[in-house]
């Protein structure tokens, strides 16, 4: 509330703006005929210091000069950077009750002289853009500081623009709002920034540049691609550029890729032929421009053009497998399976597959198209059959893949030996084997086939398989492998016209089963007891069951139970035991064992054999 200083004046020496660390003298003087009373000695002038509108100090003790009742001078030191307010008040000592009356006030600003601006850099975005320069102002001055940007060019012309920094805004960039035109391409320009405030001034070092140094071309626009004769691998990329551009950089990649293909094009004039594209692939294209072959800056990358290359006919061969099942004495069911081509082989959307089954000698041919990756037909059991499958998209079909239909496990001499399955980690199984010992024809390839051992898996799910060259004796299977599931794994050895196979079970991870088998019946036949059970439900097996154990002990006995261990076979659900005494009541139960351990016991059944038991 320093209204109009009616009562007096406040002055500052040496000035109201002082350098950091300096002292100042503040004088407060009453105007004539102003004061508390007709007795000047009762006038007491006090000086109060405010920072951010908060009273921080009464400077009563800092008085250095006093004309009693008329004026007082106070020395202030250790002022902090920024602005400090001082208010002079009149305290009438003969009236204790009245508060001091404001006389006048002054603001003192403490700051530093500006440092020379540094790191000046100027850019003009596009041939028609305007020149904007930025710089590093150095330390904060805490005072209003004016900056003048001066640009000197050809024909002895100098342009300039100003801005200022204070506690509300910072000035370290100026857009001159004027354009350097291409006709000045060879000219040199000098730019400097001058800073000035109440405590001093400083100038940057001159910064010299040419038109080509500072003009960043606008990124190319209106990007499009034209595929020659609807080719999926060749296209002409076209775009619009500023007139002075002499160099372009093109980058393109399939959308799911992590690395760009880069191309430099000189004097492209908005056109470039690409010859190595992948058909039916989503691509992203971007272009950047430069005004000079050696100097200057690249533009920002253009907006992306995203487009898919056209289709081309499929290449590569389908991976085919099959299953044979005899239906009756003269008919068999052939189920053909094949894997989808990968995108680089399919080169388009596969519309259908052309399937052919042919009897070689009688020239019988069954043909069909399907959109699925399997096909089943019933054919005679006689004759030599061959199958072929090809994939078709809108541009054509792949070369057909042929496979001879042979009895896959018909030749014992071709059966691989010492097949083993080891779990490698949670999602794969390492299968190894030895070649057939006495094969009378050369093994052309091995097929490792696997399927989850769950009810109905043969009919519900197609098999998974891997083709292995004849000199390899191992395969790491991972497709559709889940932990705690038991898989039946077959290794087929195929020659030109025969097949042999060996089978094993395996899992990628196992736990002890959740429960034991459920005993459903105990029957006595010919002095032997037959224990019947139901298998553990598939989800509770938790891996491949290696064997079952049947436990028994006399009822109420505290002795250890006896046990009989049975090799697990899926088809078996009963087993005889013959070491129980007649007319003794026994308690029986079963457990199941995986490589991880034994299940809890299943249900208990009591039985008392009647007949003579050995």
């Amino acid at each position: 509330n320093i209204d109009v200083c009616k009562l007096g004046t406040v002055t500052v020496q040496p000035a109201p703006v002082i350098p950091l660390g300096s002292a100042a003298n503040i004088s407060c003087s009453l105007n004539p005929k102003q004061g508390c009373s007709h007795y000047p000695s009762s006038n007491e002038l006090i000086l109060l210091k405010f920072v951010n509108d908060v009273l921080v100090e009464n400077l009563h003790g800092k008085k250095v000069h006093d004309h009693t009742g008329h004026s007082s001078t106070f020395q202030v030191t250790n002022l902090s950077l920024g602005m400090t307010l001082f208010v002079c008040k009149l305290n009438c000592s003969n009236s204790q009750k009245k508060p001091p009356v404001p006389v006048c006030g002054v603001e003192i600003s403490v700051g530093v002289a500006p440092e020379p601006p540094q790191n000046i850099s100027c850019v003009q975005e596009g041939e028609n853009g305007t020149v904007a320069c930025s710089w590093n102002s150095g330390k904060v001055t805490y005072l209003k500081t004016n900056y003048t940007l001066q640009l000197s060019g050809p024909n002895n012309l100098t342009c300039q623009k100003q801005c200022f920094s204070d506690n509300r805004q910072n000035c370290n960039r100026l857009d001159l709002g004027i354009n350097l035109s291409p006709d000045l391409a060879e000219s040199r320009f000098i730019v400097r920034v001058t800073a000035i405030n109440d405590l001093g001034n400083s100038s940057s070092l001159p910064h010299t540049f040419t038109f080509l140094d500072i003009v960043i071309p606008l990124p190319p626009w209106d990007i499009r691609i034209n595929f020659l004769n609807a080719s999926g691998s060749r296209g002409t990329l076209q775009w619009e550029d500023e007139g002075q551009v002499v160099l372009n950089q093109l980058r393109y990649q399939p959308l799911n890729s992590t690395s760009w293909n880069m191309v430099n094009a000189t004097n492209a004039k908005g056109k470039y032929d690409l010859r190595d594209l992948r058909p039916f692939t989503e691509y992203e294209f971007q272009i950047s421009s430069k005004l000079h072959l050696s100097g200057g800056s690249w533009s920002n990358w253009s907006e992306s053009l995203r487009t898919r290359t056209p289709e081309e006919e499929p290449v590569g061969i389908l991976d085919i497998w099959y299953m044979k099942q005899d239906i009756d004495y003269d008919r068999q069911q052939i189920s053909l399976f094949w894997k989808s081509l990968n995108p680089s082989e399919a080169r388009g959307k596969i519309l259908h597959y052309q399937v052919t089954l042919q009897e070689v000698t009688k020239k019988t041919t069954l043909q069909n198209t399907t959109r699925h990756t399997s096909w089943t037909r019933v054919i005679p059991r006689t004759g030599a059959w061959t199958a072929s499958v090809s994939a078709a998209n809108s541009k054509g079909a792949s070369a057909p893949t042929h496979i001879n239909i042979v009895d896959l496990c018909g030749t014992g001499l071709l059966a691989p030996h010492q097949v083993s399955a080891k779990s490698e980690n949670m999602d794969n199984i390492l299968v190894t084997w030895q070649p057939p010992k006495k094969a009378d024809s050369a093994v052309r390839e091995y097929i490792v086939e696997w399927r989850a051992l769950q009810p109905g898996s043969i009919t519900k799910f197609p098999p998974h398989w891997l083709r292995i060259p004849p000199d390899n004796m191992s395969a790491l299977i991972s497709e559709n492998i889940k932990p705690y599931i038991c898989y039946e794994i077959r290794v087929h050895a195929l020659s030109e016209s025969q097949g042999g196979c060996s089978s094993i079970r395996g899992d990628s991870k196992h736990k002890a089963p959740v429960s034991g088998p459920h005993i459903t019946a105990i029957t006595e036949k010919k002095e032997r007891l037959f224990i019947s059970w139901t298998h553990i439900p598939f989800p509770e097996q938790r891996g491949c069951i290696l064997h079952y154990r049947i436990y028994w002990k006399e009822r109420d006995s505290t002795a250890q139970p006896e046990l009989c261990e049975i090799q697990y076979r899926r088809s078996q659900n009963s087993h005889p035991i013959s070491s129980l005494q007649p007319r003794v009541t026994y308690v029986l139960w079963m457990t199941a064992v995986t490589a991880a351990g034994e299940s809890p016991q299943g249900n208990e059944r009591e039985f008392c054999p009647q007949g003579k038991a050995n």
Partner: nanobody, 125 residues
Framework: QVQLQESGGGSVQAGGSLRLSCAVS????????MGWFRQAPGKEREFVAA???????VYPNSVKGRITISRDNAKNAVYLQMNALKPEDTAVYYC???????????????????WGQGTQVTVSS
């Protein structure tokens, strides 16, 4: 109709000062580049000062420091403050206006679309 009217010219002793004014009607000064040119008897018209629409000022090095161009958007006027005048500053001073954005263009008279009638400045020694 666009009109530019100069005023403030006259005779002055060497070392003295003058402030020329250019009142504009029919266009807004803040939307255009404004320039001052002068023509001494028997000589070609020469560039003295300009201010772009973005308030960037341009001077030939020969007058830099003695001459200042400014504008008052509220009054739709442009001014030329001339200090430390010399006899060679004697000329007719013209105010001009045009949609110019290039550095060189601000100093080229053929880039300016509108011109005033001029005001005479005479500096005697």
């Amino acid at each position: 109709q666009v009109q530019l009217q100069e005023s403030g010219g006259g005779s002055v002793q060497a070392g003295g000062s003058l402030r020329l004014s250019c009142a504009v009607s029919g266009r807004t000064v803040s939307d255009y580049a404004m320039g001052w040119f002068r023509q001494a008897p028997g000589k070609e018209r020469e560039f003295v000062a300009a201010m772009s629409s973005s308030e960037t000022t341009v001077y030939p090095n020969s007058v830099k420091g003695r001459i200042t161009i400014s504008r008052d958007n509220a009054k739709n006027a442009v001014y030329l403050q001339m200090n430390a005048l010399k006899p060679e500053d004697t000329a007719v001073y013209y105010c001009s206006m045009g949609p110019i954005v290039t550095f060189q263009g601000l100093a080229r008279q053929n880039e300016y679309h509108y011109w005033g009638q001029g005001t005479q400045v005479t500096v005697s020694s």
